[in-house]
């Protein structure tokens, strides 16, 4: 697994760098994070053929993976910082879940999925100390995630797969436009 | 890092159009942010607009914005920047840039490719 933020070589190299600022901080937890959802979806698709598949046909589907909208204040029309920085903290903690889902689908890259599954955690914690409003913030319920962890597992194996892929792809755009809008704050 | 190649600059005159195109030949090109950004003579370079690896996921710069309109055509490989309306202070080298992790920003520093540049003069 890549090493975590902020302990590349580089770090090392450069003791008397400026140490990171909070959205520099969160600018790179991010990348990485995007990083790891890199690996993993090259031994998805390396696996299978779900790759291939059209966004339209893999949007049949009965997940229910947090995405952005308009109305979240994290596009350019009707931005609000406020409201999105509450969208993307919420999603991260809906998104756990599903990453918690990922963690025995690797084969090759098990230390990969895990890096990726505690560097959100840690992303949320940074997250949550930028927010003010942390009283609109809802954490899903731990039962009904238990019931959906159980259900996704008793899928059969092309079920499971195409849950996998459909998971990295939604993380992958959430974390996207989630930067994207950070990088206005 | 991808090639990334602009075309489409010239000589226009004041209310006129025109449009950009940033083309690269290398593989997984949708998978990149793309960053329109311009430098006039004795200025420093500046964010013009950006498209994300979701091509509905865009941002202007608060100069351009209703005049361009930044797209994708990722089975071309390309990313067009419509500009229309165009002011003799729209006059400068137009440059894209992309960012691998398809997020992109009004950063310099986001990017890591960028082209040669194409010049772009409003004048009558």
């Known amino acids: 697994a890549p090493v975590p933020p902020g302990e590349d070589s580089k770090d090392v190299a450069a003791p008397h760098r400026q140490p990171l600022t909070s959205s520099e901080r969160i600018d790179k937890q991010i990348r990485y994070i995007l990083d790891g959802i890199s690996a993993l979806r090259k031994e998805t698709c390396n696996k299978s053929n779900m790759c291939e598949s059209s966004k339209e046909a893999l949007a049949e589907n009965n997940l229910n993976l947090p995405k952005m909208a308009e109305k979240d204040g994290c596009f350019q029309s009707g931005f609000n910082e406020e409201t999105c920085l509450v969208k993307i903290i919420t999603g991260l903690l809906e998104f756990e879940v599903y990453l918690e889902y990922l963690q025995n689908r690797f084969e090759s890259s098990e230390e990969q999925a895990r890096a990726v599954q505690m560097s959100t955690k840690v992303l949320i914690q940074f997250l949550q100390k930028k927010a003010k409003n942390l009283d609109a913030i809802t954490t899903p319920d731990p039962t009904t995630n238990a019931s959906l962890l159980t259900k996704l597992q008793a899928q059969n194996q092309w079920l499971q797969d195409m849950t996998t892929h459909l998971i990295l792809r939604s993380f992958k755009e959430f974390l996207q436009s989630s930067l994207r809008a950070l990088r206005q704050m | 890092e991808v090639q990334l190649v602009e075309s489409g600059g010239g000589l226009v005159q004041p209310g006129g159009s025109l449009k950009l195109s940033c083309t690269t030949s290398g593989r997984r090109f949708s998978e990149y942010a793309v960053g329109w950004f311009r430098q006039a003579p004795g200025k420093e370079r500046e964010f013009v607009a950006d498209?994300?690896?979701?091509?509905?996921?865009?941002w202007y710069a608060e100069s351009v914005k209703g005049r361009f309109t930044i797209s994708r055509d990722d089975a071309k490989n390309t990313v067009y920047l419509e500009m229309d309306g165009l002011k003799p202070e729209d006059t400068a080298v137009y440059y894209c840039?992309?960012?691998?992790?398809?997020?992109?920003?009004?950063?310099?520093?986001?990017?890591?490719?960028w082209g040669q540049g194409t010049q772009v003069t409003v004048s009558s």
């Open positions: 840039a992309a960012d691998k992790y398809g997020v992109g920003g009004n950063a310099q520093g986001y990017y890591d490719s």
């Open positions: 498209i994300g690896e979701q091509a509905e996921n865009t």
